[in-house]
């Protein structure tokens, strides 16, 4: 049987002779040279050679464990004379023994990392990793330890993990933003004689809102004319903030001062400036100087830095208003007045008031722009601005009168202002209802009692035009003796009904019925209208045969009775034919 074990060979042999590996030996070998040793497998004959007589194995070349840590070979012992094996072929291994010939290598030549400024000590920044090609299972050749060569006292590295952390309190980006840290990785557990490698870590401090805005000056002064319309920019102020990005965003506001309601401040998002603008119309005569307190504040505040103080600053803004010569100003932009339509001439409706806003307080006089009141219905007292009627009004003719009043400075007629007056004429129930049309109707001589011969409608010019409730009745003087009755339908219509059986056109050819119409409003208005009823001869079919001719050629045409039809283009005979009057034997 074979007498050998696995062989160990130190890597990176530097001797001048071949490196001895070991000896193959069979107990069949009597030392007489009758056996021949043969080597085959990984590197046999090239890397590894064998003395065929003695079985000694040597390595011909310098071996690198990191390149190949194990070689598998086969050994044979054969009878030199017969060539037959005296031992079965056996496999053996040559294991390359590690030496510390590799330094640790970082995964990156340069690392980049960020960490917020003002971070707590021990805040994780980045983890670096170095690897060592040596055998980790034997000795400490591959046991890497990390240390910091450059970057103290700002940062530290955990020796075993390579985790870089902040090491200094209150690192301020505004003071220093960039740090270059050099980390060493050393094998042999960091002991003397270990190999090492380094890497560079570029660390940038990111911004946090740790700086409040600051005005570079405590007072600003601007000027603006009193005529500046709302929205006019007056001036710009700028607070500086050492932070960047959204942490340096600034909102401006007016926090105090007499001009709080007169001015606005808006933030220019591009420049982060505060633009002071006019909010309301200024008046030099009321106030010449405004002093505002303007505040600049960060909208994005980090609560943990509030202990540093408020993240805002304030400055005083003094605004001087320049005088501009102005026309008179009315107390209102427009005046709405009301007057009843039954107002007498010289009735006062109301008054307007205007004043010279300038410091001079020039007196003003008032007048009506006659282009807006051609009929001279209204007048104004030039001194006190009282408006009064100079003619009678009628709401039904004109509901609204829109006139313009002018106020002029007496000492400077070029300075004048105009104001619209909207005068509403209030309704008074001063119109009586009247028939909607001229009513002329017909009745057959043989008509029966209670037959409807005409429906009446009324209209009223008063308000509400379509909302009146009318009552109809025969005038009292006709009520008792009338041959007809009025039936009020309670829907703003009334019917004329026959009151008796039969009429004689030879006795009475035409009836005039006085009908009283009243509105149910207050003061009560009523009128009397007359309805003409003609008595006609009719045949047994209810067709009219003869009537007084004037009934048929009345300029307003015919108002036909119940169940009747009327064609405006009919001839005279056709008209007779068209009148269908119901009657009963």
């Amino acid at each position: 049987s074979w007498m050998w074990n696995q062989f160990f060979l130190l890597e990176e042999y530097t001797g001048s002779d071949y490196q001895y590996v070991g000896k193959l030996h069979s107990d069949q070998d009597r030392g007489d040279g009758s056996l021949k040793y043969i080597l085959s497998g990984d590197g046999a004959g090239d890397l590894f050679i064998i003395n065929e007589n003695t079985g000694d194995i040597q390595a011909t070349k310098r071996l690198d464990r990191e390149e190949k840590p194990v070689y598998i070979l086969r050994a044979q012992a054969v009878n030199r004379r017969t060539g037959r094996p005296v031992e079965p072929e056996s496999e053996f291994i040559i294991k390359i023994h590690d030496i510390n010939d590799n330094e640790p290598i970082f995964t990156k030549d340069v690392y980049t990392a960020t960490v917020p400024e003002m971070a707590d000590v021990g805040t994780f920044v980045v983890q670096v990793t170095a690897t060592d090609a040596d055998d980790p299972t034997y000795g400490n050749s591959a046991k890497v330890v990390y240390s910091i060569l450059q970057g103290q006292p700002y940062f530290s590295v955990e020796s075993e993990t390579g985790i870089i952390k902040t090491a200094l309190l209150n690192m301020d980006r505004e003071n220093r933003e960039q740090y270059q840290v050099v980390i060493q990785a050393k094998d042999m557990g960091g002991q003397m004689g270990g190999l090492s490698g380094t890497t560079t870590v570029n660390i940038t401090l990111t911004d946090v809102n740790d700086n409040p805005p600051r005005f570079p000056q405590s007072t600003y002064q601007f000027k603006t004319p009193e005529s500046s319309p709302p929205g006019t920019p007056i001036g710009r102020i700028k607070a500086s903030d050492a932070d960047v990005g959204e942490n340096a965003e600034i909102e401006y506001s007016i926090t105090d001062g007499e001009g709080h309601e007169m001015f606005d401040v808006i933030t220019d998002q591009e420049t982060q400036e505060g633009i002071i603008t006019v909010k309301k119309l200024l008046d030099f005569e009321k106030k010449k100087v405004y002093t505002l307190k303007v505040e600049a504040s960060n909208p994005h505040v980090e609560p943990r830095f509030l202990y540093l103080g408020p993240f805002k600053d304030s400055a005083t803004v003094r605004i001087v208003v320049d005088d501009v010569d102005e026309p008179p100003v009315f107390s209102k932009l427009a005046y709405i007045l009301q007057i009843r339509e039954d107002a007498r001439i010289n009735t006062t409706i109301g008054s307007v008031a205007a004043q010279d806003p300038d410091a001079a307080r020039n007196p003003v006089k008032y007048s009506v722009d006659r282009h807006t009141d051609m009929d001279r219905i209204f007048n104004i007292d030039s001194g006190n601005g009282s408006i009064f009627t100079s003619k009678l009004l009628d709401r039904e003719t004109l509901l609204w009168h829109n006139i313009t009043v002018i106020a002029t400075e007496i000492n400077n007629p070029k300075q004048s202002s105009r104001v619209p007056l909207y005068i509403k004429v209030l309704d008074v129930n001063d119109n009586a209802p009247e028939f909607a049309e001229f009513y002329e109707t017909f009745v057959c001589e043989k008509a029966k009692a209670d037959q409807l011969i005409q429906t009446l409608r009324a209209v009223d010019k008063d308000d509400p035009y379509s909302g009146h409730q009318f009552s109809f009745s025969l005038a009292p003087e006709a009520a008792s003796s009338s041959n007809f009755t009025i039936q009020d339908n309670k829907d703003n219509t009334a019917g004329i009904l026959t009151r008796k059986n039969g009429y004689n056109r030879h006795e009475m050819s035409t009836y005039l019925l006085p009908v009283v119409i009243s509105d149910n409003d207050y003061p009560v208005q009523s009128s009397t209208g007359t309805v003409t009823v003609r008595v006609c001869a009719c045949d047994h079919h209810g067709n009219m045969q003869s009537c007084h001719a004037e009934a048929l050629i009345h300029p307003t045409g015919l108002s036909t009775g119940a169940g009747s039809e009327f064609r405006h283009d009919s001839g005279l005979n056709d008209i007779f034919e068209a009148q269908k009057i119901e009657w009963h034997e």
């Epitope: 509400p464 009552s471 009745s473 207050y522 003061p523």
Partner: antibody, heavy 118, light 111 residues
Framework: QVQLLESGGGLVQPGGSLRLSCAAS????????MNWVRQAPGKGLEWVSV????????NYADSVKGRFTISRDNSKNTLYLQMNSLRAEDTAVYYC???????????WGQGTLVTVSS | DIVLTQPPSVSGAPGQRVTISCSGS????????VSWYQQLPGTAPKLLIY???NRPSGVPDRFSGSKSGTSASLAITGLQAEDEADYYC???????????FGGGTKLTVLG
């Protein structure tokens, strides 16, 4: 159907105030003038006040002039009577009534009693 | 103050005819229509006659009205027990744009 419903009556001391309301339904309230009529206990009917359909014209009996104010809210179909400086002789049942048919009052409310007493 | 004059009371036996008069002036009855109201005990007035002589629907034709000059009258025929009530005449007054009432007449149905 037409309905008029008064409310707001009650006991009040002389010199006090009261506001009566009359809720109208079943007709176009804004087209009619409206009246208040009162009836003292055991006495006849006495017209009190009238208001035009739009509310722009009003009139009062001499006995209440300057103390009573009639008004209306057409959007709410409601008639009002504001009574100030009340006297013992104002004690009565107050009716709201609609004038129609040539000023005949065709519809009346059920009435609300106002008692002025110390 | 009462402007129209009515008798304080009238009476009649069932089936009889009674009339109630009402007199005024030219500014009221003389130039405007007359209306009549019936008031049963404890109830609101009810329109009985309008436009001098017209009856609203539901009012029996036993009730009729008339007007002459500055006077008006209400006639009730076929008197019935349920007719016992107070009756008031009324008119619009054109002079001061107000409504005027009579003092009321108490109708008693005898027996």
């Amino acid at each position: 159907q037409v309905q008029l419903l008064e409310s707001g009556g009650g006991l009040v001391q002389p010199g006090g105030s009261l506001r009566l309301s009359c809720a109208a339904s079943g007709f176009t309230f804004s087209s009619f003038a409206m009246n208040w009529v009162r009836q003292a206990p055991g006495k006849g009917l006495e017209w009190v006040s009238v208001i035009s359909s739009s509310g722009s014209n009003t009139n009062y009996a001499d006995s209440v002039k300057g103390r009573f104010t009639i008004s209306r809210d057409n959007s709410k179909n409601t008639l009002y009577l504001q009574m100030n400086s009340l006297r013992a002789e104002d004690t009565a049942v107050y009716y709201c009534a609609r004038p129609s048919y040539f000023q005949a009052m065709d519809y009346w409310g059920q009435g609300t009693l106002v008692t002025v007493s110390s | 103050d009462i402007v129209l004059t009515q008798p304080p009371s009238v009476s009649g036996a069932p089936g009889q005819r009674v009339t109630i008069s009402c007199s005024g002036s030219s500014s009221n009855i003389g130039s405007n229509f007359v209306s009549w109201y019936q008031q049963l005990p404890g109830t609101a007035p009810k329109l009985l006659i309008y436009d001098n002589s017209n009856r609203p629907s539901g009012v029996p034709d036993r009730f009729s009205g008339s007007k002459s000059g500055t006077s008006a009258s209400l006639a009730i025929t076929g008197l019935q027990a349920e007719d016992e009530a107070d009756y008031y005449c009324s008119s619009y007054d054109s002079f001061d744009h107000s409504w005027v009432f009579g003092g009321g007449t108490k109708l008693t149905v005898l027996g």
